[in-house]
Amino acid sequence: VPRWRQQWSGPGTTKRFPETVLARCVKYTEIHPEMRHVDCQSVWDAFKGAFISKHPCNITEEDYQPLMKLGTQTVPCNKILLWSRIKDLAHQFTQVQRDMFTLEDTLLGYLADDLTWCGEFNTSKINYQSCPDWRKDCSNNPVSVFWKTVSRRFAEAACDVVHVMLNGSRSKIFDKNSTFGSVEVHNLQPEKVQTLEAWVIHGGREDSRDLCQDPTIKELESIISKRNIQFSCKNIYRPDKFLQCVKNPEDSSCTSEI
């Protein structure tokens, strides 16, 4: 008789999840000499241990602590780029500006980027059929708790000027409910961070509005200022040109507004 299985509202675990995590770990540790000491089998065991045999709505940050310990990594605290709803451009930027880091440029972020996973209470099986949706099912699911945990730690590590890329095409350029708005903003350490510098990325070719005056950006400024961190904002009108100028600042077109 087939065992009854909980049906969740979200997509199931990414196919070949264990193999993908292990392969990514091996690749990352080969490319990054400072992480060569990491034992990828132990990393996978710790990752698996965080959610296997546990109810996928009862995951805690504590469940991920063994993985966090194994994935401990020092990134230059003044070279951190946060992002909200504009991941691709943020990643393109750090691919060019190699000394800056998004969360997904760290081992743990790289392992989990774009993946979904969950288990089932009291069985050692991975659920490939469905996983809890943050809104429709529960917020304490394996994926959400993982990203909340690593995002908090990443923000806590930041110092000096912290940069954040925001999507100017969204109705809420700054969204209090995003990971940036709900986790990272509140875990920047005022004794280490002098300034949060927002880059608002424009979508339309002819959009010359100053989106730094947007009400949601003013809300972000207010939250940051109350935390005794300075705030600054810059429009990036031409993201394509911006990336080109990061690659080659000598280019004559880089003298005008980007």
Epitope: N78, E197, W199, K234, C245, C254
Partner: nanobody, 122 residues
């Protein structure tokens, strides 16, 4: 190519004020982070302050509350307002530029001025 020229350095009494200027030619500064460093004889170049393309500022602990960095993109000039000067602020001050982001490490700046001497003495 960016050319930077510092000015404003002179002899000033302890507790006095001074404003250093750094004028850029060759291209507009609006997309550039600008910084001030200082270096005494036989010493490492030391970060003082920076201002990014988006005007966010960063200061060394030893100048916080005493020095202020600012920029005027229309004049293509960056300033360092130095207040409550101390004898230990005596040295040569350099202006530097790099694309977009201000950082503390001198090695990350592509363009440098020739420097201006500041002497704090009674």
């Amino acid at each position: 190519q960016v050319k930077l020229q510092e000015s404003g350095g002179r002899l000033v009494q302890p507790g006095g004020s001074l404003r250093l200027s750094c004028a850029a030619s060759g291209r507009t500064l609006s997309n550039y982070a600008m910084a001030w460093f200082r270096q005494g004889p036989g010493k490492e170049r030391e970060f003082v302050a920076s201002i990014s393309a988006s005007d966010s500022t960063l200061y060394a602990d030893f100048v916080k509350g005493r020095f202020t960095i600012s920029r005027d993109n229309a004049k293509n000039t960056v300033y360092l307002q130095m207040d409550s000067l101390k004898p230990e602020d005596t040295t040569v001050y350099y202006c530097a530029a790099r694309f977009w982001i201000g950082v503390r490490a001198p090695a990350e700046y592509n363009y440098w001025g020739q420097g201006t001497q500041v002497t704090v003495s009674s």
